[in-house]
């Protein structure tokens, strides 16, 4: 989703880890939303 950043070596070295971090963050957000929804 960031084509220009692909020229940066950092992108190559961290791509998988950043994707994992993003997935984990989305999972945590979804869980927080579920807790809020359940409490309503």
């Amino acid at each position: 989703d960031n084509p220009s950043l692909s020229i940066d070596l950092t992108f190559h070295l961290l791509r998988t880890l950043l994707e994992l971090a993003r997935t984990q963050s989305q999972r945590e957000r979804a869980e927080q939303n579920r807790i809020i929804f359940d409490s309503v």
Epitope: S4, D8, L9
Partner: antibody, heavy 118, light 112 residues
């Protein structure tokens, strides 16, 4: 010419927070990740974390999770780092750095000195 | 974390001499892509670090050819032929193959 201009020195009290800046020029800010490095007095270098200026994705060195918070302002091509709950252990020079397609720390800011003292 | 150990801690040289700095990693720093992300930096007194060598042996733009890097796996060397006054300072090796990225403790190159 790639330039990373950092904010000035900070003298702060234990327990306080500090926010420093790193203004980028000479290249397209969103083309490269921004990294932050700590150098304690007379000591080696420690990588703190890295931020993607496009979407704010951050990856921290586990050691600095909870201590450092990285952000960017795309409109001013500026990266920020906030350090919280400061102790004497946080007294150091903090530098921002940018890589290239070949290396991770090709260009460096001049560093921001943070002194934590009561 | 990958420990990067540099030797010697201090290296006194006469200007014009050759200098050699060693860097050893606690484990192989060959990345899963086959590359070895070993870099060398020089920090002159009162200045920010400056990139000299990337991927073990490649000189960064503007770096004189008297600087050369070599090594593989866990053992790496930076050589400076004909040391000049502008080469004095602290040299750091760095690995970017494993997270967290780590720097060596530094080698101070000084005049004998």
């Amino acid at each position: 010419e790639v330039q990373l201009q950092q904010s000035g020195p900070e003298l702060v009290k234990p327990g306080a927070s500090v926010k420093m800046s790193c203004k980028a020029s000479g290249y397209t800010f969103t083309d490269y990740f921004m990294k932050w490095v700590k150098q304690s007095h007379g000591e080696s270098l420690e990588w703190i974390g890295v931020i993607n200026p496009n979407n704010g994705d951050i990856f921290y060195n586990q050691k600095f999770k909870g201590k450092a918070t990285l952000t960017v302002d795309k409109s001013s091509s500026t990266a920020f780092m906030q350090l919280n709950s400061l102790t004497s252990e946080d007294s150091a020079v903090y530098s921002c750095a940018r890589g290239t397609d070949r290396a991770l720390f090709a260009y460096w800011g001049q560093g921001t000195l943070v002194a934590v003292s009561a | 974390d990958v420990l990067m150990t540099q030797t010697p801690l201090s290296l006194p040289v006469s200007l014009g001499d050759q200098a050699s700095i060693s860097c050893r990693s606690g484990q192989s720093i060959v990345h899963s892509d086959g590359n070895t992300y070993l870099e060398w930096y020089l920090q002159r007194p009162g200045q920010s670090p400056r990139l000299l060598i990337y991927k073990v042996s490649n000189r960064f733009s503007g770096v004189p050819d008297r600087f050369s890097g070599s090594g593989s796996g866990t053992d790496f060397t930076l050589k400076i032929s004909r040391v000049g006054a502008e080469d004095l300072g602290i040299y750091y090796c760095f690995q970017g193959s494993h997270i967290p990225w780590t720097f060596g403790g530094g080698t101070k190159l000084e005049v004998k």
